[in-house]
Interface confidence: low
């Protein structure tokens, strides 16, 4: 289409385009449910699927829930955008010791440099404070760590990064050879500050990290501990439990250490559009009283899959369809998948809209 000042009627006769007076160009009309990525889209690839609020379109074109930064020790670093998750980081004065996808599973307070040490690098959201001797060059030769009065330059002192772990009361003390000691002290041995910034947005590569409670000697019963409202998924990642905070949802099962919270529609409502561990859209029960079905699954599986009963089985209860034959269409590119399922409320593919020609071009 002409780029410079076409007349308004240049686009007439082509229903897939419209004239934008502001930019004085013919623009591609995104199909219903798709949204332009720029002011004047020129082609189908300039249109994208719209995800629900607090969801983003991931690299595989799937609507994925943005993480929440609602924990006290987290702050929002970047907001939830159409194509990227919200990113959370530890609040000022804390660093991330166990990273989670787009967030941090465990934040510790920055260490305070002990006497005789000064701050070499201040703590950040990703790294603990790095201390060095107050008098550079004076570095005692250490035959063993126990003999060192001060760590040598550039090393991180065993200062006591303090975990914020409101989830467990056992975080305050731990058994050590028959007695108890401050968990902070144990934590300083269990959790060294990372040498390089942990990669926010990626699962922690360190598999063990934090036990549920410091391991009694000789005990192998240690597993990674996630923060409240997170669970440990099969891949060993701390993953946010779904939230049932919507008015039409109630909690069915709580957020556990190894399984997500599950939500279901509140009494009097039925799930019309399911979502993992929850329901994306609840609707009032039809008068003919269909029932919500839970697909039975092996109890060991983490996700329960909810679905509404086949609406077609009770024609009088069918809240939906506007019928009509859809034309065949083709995609110009083999784009990655779109995710939005058979939902009336969670559209829409990024791949090609309905083609006007039957040639696939």
């Amino acid at each position: 289409f002409p780029q410079d000042r076409p007349f308004e009627d240049t686009c007439h006769g082509n229903p897939s385009h419209y004239y934008d007076k502001a930019v004085r160009r013919c623009c591609y009309r995104c199909p219903m449910g798709l949204f332009p990525t720029q002011q004047c889209p020129q082609r189908p690839t300039d249109c994208r699927k719209q995800c629900e609020p607090d969801y983003y379109l991931d690299e595989a074109d799937r609507c994925t829930a943005c993480v929440t930064c609602s924990r006290d020790d987290l702050v929002e670093k970047t907001p939830c955008a159409w194509n990227s998750s919200r990113v959370c980081e530890c609040r000022p004065g804390m660093f991330c010791s166990t990273s989670a996808v787009n967030s941090c599973a465990r934040c510790f307070f920055h260490s305070v440099c002990p006497a005789g040490m000064i701050v070499k690098f201040p703590g950040t959201a990703q790294k603990n404070t790095v201390c060095e001797p107050a008098s550079p060059g004076v570095s005692p030769a250490c035959a063993s760590p126990e003999n060192c009065k001060e760590p040598s330059s550039g090393t991180i002192p065993q200062a006591k990064p303090t975990p914020v772990s409101p989830a467990t009361s056992s975080a305050s003390t731990m058994p050590v050879r028959g007695g108890t000691r401050l968990a902070q002290e144990a934590a300083s041995k269990l959790t060294r500050a990372p040498d390089s910034p942990s990669s926010v947005g990626r699962p922690s590569s360190d598999p063990g990290l934090s036990p549920t409670q410091p391991c009694p000697e000789g005990s192998g019963d240690c597993r990674k501990q996630c923060e409240p409202d997170y669970y440990l998924d099969e891949a060993g990642r701390c993953t946010a439990c779904v939230s049932c905070s919507r008015d039409d949802l109630v909690e069915k099962t709580p957020c556990a250490w190894n399984s997500s919270r599950t939500c279901e529609c509140r009494p009097g409502m039925i799930c019309a559009t399911s979502a993992t561990n929850s329901c994306a859209r609840c609707v009032p029960y039809p008068i003919c009283a269909a029932e919500t079905v839970t697909k039975p699954q092996d109890m060991a599986e983490k996700d329960t899959t909810f679905e509404a009963p086949p609406l077609g089985t009770q024609p009088d209860c069918n809240p939906t369809p506007e019928n009509g034959e859809a034309p065949a269409s083709t995609s110009p590119t083999q784009s990655l998948l779109v995710d939005s399922q058979a939902s009336k409320t969670l559209p829409i593919p990024t791949s090609a809209p309905v083609a006007l020609s039957s040639t696939g071009k």
């Epitope: 991931d58 899959t305 083999q334 399922q341 058979a342 969670l346 829409i348």
Partner: antibody, heavy 125, light 111 residues
Amino acid sequence: EVKLVESGGGLVQPGGSLRLSCATSGFTFSDYYMNWVRQPPGKALEWLGFIRNKANGYTTEFSASVMGRFTISRDDSQSILYLQMNTLRAEDSATYYCARDPPYGNPHYYAMDYWGQGTSVTVSS
Amino acid sequence: DIVLTQSPASLAVSLGQRATISCRASKSVSASGYNYMHWYQQKAGQPPKLLIHLASNLESGVPARFSGSGSGTDFTLNIHPVEEEDASTYYCQHSGELPFTFGSGTKLEIK
């Protein structure tokens, strides 16, 4: 009971065309993405393509082997899925299945939970 | 396209024993914490039947002797204990990206 029944198969000459149908019942057809898969005699399954539902713009995706030659369409009012096959080749001879894509929510994981019995297509001169 | 390599091409297992079928993808089919691999059973003269979705989730009505595992590029279907009626060809299918592809199939024979 969910049912899918393919029809329209038969013998066709190379270069010819054929339109397969898949009549469905027992579920709300308009809600579902629908797939076509084929299987040459004694060989593996091959995914051909799918058509999304109305909420997702009725858009389609295809495998490279049939792109530009095959098109998929649907009639939600009749609960029928179609596969229009043009410029047929000998290697298109196979049993053709339509299959439903289960809409279990995010993520949409693109499996096929119900299949028809298949219709046989032979391309030969 | 992602190529799925199934092995073995065929196997014979005694009644009550374990059958293990492997499916290797030429590229990871895991994304956003999900493993986009599914398993189907096809008996002679019948259409395929979905057994497992997202690598490890058993479909409704499928016996618990079927189980799936794996992530990234390596996936496994296990059947234990094997029964007579399990004699079939088994296919893996990925949906990690377009186009979707199936594995070449593994034929299970019961001894």
